[in-house]
Structures are given as C-alpha cells and as structure tokens.
C-alpha cells in the first residue's frame, strides 16, 4: 500500500448512535495541510461519509452539516460519527491525503467495523 | 527551484551492469521517497523501483520485470538516489526518469542495451 | 496487480474543443490516482494528483473527476500547446502501475 494508516479494526457505537475511533498515520514527511476522509463500504459499494482538510496544529473543520466531527494531534485524527442507526452497521475506512507541501501521498486504513444497535423503545408506564 | 539529475546512462551490452545517479536539490530529499520510472515507445512509462524514506526504514519495491536485478538505493548525506542495474536486457532500453514522491521528475537518462 | 486501462489510445480534436480521456482500474482505488503530461522531448509532468486536484503551475482548463474504478482527465478550450501524451497512474498500492497513455493531437 502506499502511506500506511493503521484505524481500529472494530468499534461498536454508543446508545446514542455515536462512535468514534482514532486513524493514525505513518508521515514520510512534513505535511502542513491534510485532508482526512472516511469512507463506508457495504455490498462492494463505497461512499464517501464526510471530508475535512485541516492544517497540522489546527482543529479539522467538517462540512456545519457533517455527521463527523474529530480533533487532531500530530499524525493522529480521533474522528466520531453521530447520528448512525442500525442500518448504518458497516465497514468504515479512513482515508488520508497529505496535500501540502508536495509531493503528494496518499493512503487508506483497512477499515473499522462500526456495529450500531438501535435502541429498544422505552416500555409505556400507566 | 527543484531539480532532478539524472547521470550514468549510455550503451551497454546485454547481460552487462550499469549504476544510474540521481542528484536532488530544491526539497527536502530525505522527507521523500524516490522512484524510478522508464519510458520505452513500446510500453509506454513503466515504474522500475522505490525506496522509502527513514520513518519507513528504507523499504524499497520492485516491479516484477526487474525484481532480483535491480537495486535501488539512498544517500541522504548527498541527496542522492541510485539504480544499480544487473545483467540488462533490450527490454530494459528507455529512458529512465528519477522521481520524487511521483510530483518532481528529473529530464531522464537514456539506457541502450545492444550488442 | 492493479492494472489501469486507458481510452482512448489516441484523439484528435480542434482547437476550443473540449476532450475527455477516460481511465479505468482493475480494483477500487480510492481516488489514489494521477494524471500526467508528456510533451514530445520533455518529461512527463504531473498534472492532476488525487484525482481531483490539479498540480501547481498547470492551467485551471484541465480537471479531473471520478471515484473507484472509473476516472476522467477533461481539456476544456484545447490550446495547441495542449498537444501530448497524457497518462493515468495509480498511486493506491505498489506496483505504481501507469495507463497505456492517450496521444492527443490537433486537428
């Protein structure tokens, strides 16, 4: 592969629907812009979840209608997905690009397995 | 200004040896991972070799077509990447092209190989 | 291996025209693919990194798009400076497997 990106191989998310793993990567040199996206894949279909470019030192903005939301430290992105029901049970991979300066590298992670578990409705009470 | 120097081509007989340079200036040579790539007019541009940098302990590759008689090697102090080249064949002609990362690309040096 | 598969092998179209040059990969390559310039004596240069975006100095009229297996190089207003070789790299996994190139020439 090219620039390794190593990423928890599975995560389960919260009651809430939330789940957050670190992608870590392997830097041949000094990026100073980054751009970090997860992908999901099921059924040999992959789509792209969110995207955020960021400079190294500063937060990673996402899209205000992102579901993602992640901080960096170093080669490291602590990425969390909100939002996410059962249906959304599948193969997430990190993907990471490091923009600037050239040349440019690119790698992606072998993904994590979010499990999401809806949860069950509360019983009525009289 | 990035420049990529490419020295020590030239005729050679097959099953001969030959040792390529390539002399980089204008970026940071040892944050980057260097390749070889040829162009032959019957295969178009064929990538050879790549040595990684330090945070990946120096991991080289090969293609297949060269794996076992080519070595590509680094010299950080020089900012210097070469290509050793054994036993050559006519497939090998071309003319080999030194690139950083696959962004900067050195005016290449032509290999013959011909009785 | 990853094998790229370029079309077409050569075109000729008109200066102003615009003209696509497709390339496909054998696997999902994750958008880790460039495209190249090679002018006749000169060495190739890269024109679009990461699929979509386009290197320092080339002319905002090339862009490139797509996504898994299936990319596109597109030259809008075709100057006759334009006139190449232009190939498609996978940059995802070694070997770093290059198209068969695209010959454009004006008409």
């Known amino acids: 592969k090219a620039m390794h990106v190593a990423q928890p191989a599975v995560v389960l998310a919260n009651s809430r629907g939330t789940a957050s793993f670190v992608c870590e990567y392997a830097s041949p040199g000094k990026a100073t812009e980054v751009r970090v996206t997860v992908l999901r894949q099921a059924d040999s279909q992959v789509t792209e979840v969110c995207a955020a470019t960021y400079m190294m030192g500063n937060e990673l903005t996402f899209l205000d209608d992102s579901i993602c939301t992640g901080t960096s430290s170093g080669n490291q992105v602590n990425l969390t997905i909100q939002g996410l029901r059962a249906m959304d049970t599948g193969l997430y991979i990190c993907k990471v690009e490091l923009m600037y300066p050239p040349p440019y590298y690119m790698g992606i992670g072998n993904g994590t397995q979010i499990y999401v578990i809806d949860p069950e409705p509360c019983p009525d009470s009289d | 200004e990035v420049k990529l120097d490419e020295t020590g081509g030239g005729l050679v007989q097959p099953g001969r040896s030959m040792k390529l340079s390539c002399v980089v200036s204008?970026?940071?040579?040892?944050?980057?991972?260097m390749n070889w790539v040829r162009q032959s007019p019957e295969k178009g541009l064929e990538w050879v070799a790549q040595?990684?940098?330090?945070?990946?302990?120096?991991?080289?590759y090969y293609s297949d077509s060269v794996k076992g008689r080519f070595t590509i090697s680094r010299d950080d102090s020089k900012s210097t990447v070469y290509l050793q080249m054994n036993n050559l064949r006519a497939e090998d002609m071309g003319v080999y092209y030194c690139?950083?990362?696959?962004?900067?690309w050195g005016q290449g040096t032509l290999v013959t190989v011909s009785a | 291996d990853i094998q790229m598969t370029q079309s077409p092998a050569s075109l000729s179209a008109s200066v102003g025209e615009t003209v696509t040059i497709t390339c496909g990969a054998s696997?999902?390559?994750?958008?880790?693919l460039n495209w190249y310039q090679r002018k006749q004596g000169k060495s190739p240069q890269l024109l679009i990194y990461?699929?979509?975006n386009l290197a320092e100095g080339m002319s905002s009229r090339f862009s490139g798009s797509g996504s898994g297996r299936q990319y596109s190089l597109k030259i809008s207003s075709l100057h006759p400076d334009d006139v190449a070789t232009y190939y498609c790299?996978?940059?995802?996994?070694?070997?770093?497997?290059f198209g068969g190139g695209t010959k454009l020439e004006i008409k």
């Open positions: 690139t950083g990362g696959f962004t900067y």
């Open positions: 204008g970026f940071t040579f040892s944050d980057n991972w």
């Open positions: 040595i990684r940098n330090k945070p990946y302990n120096f991991e080289t």
């Open positions: 696997e999902n390559i994750y958008g880790g």
């Open positions: 990461g699929a979509t």
């Open positions: 790299q996978n940059v995802l996994s070694s070997p770093w497997t």
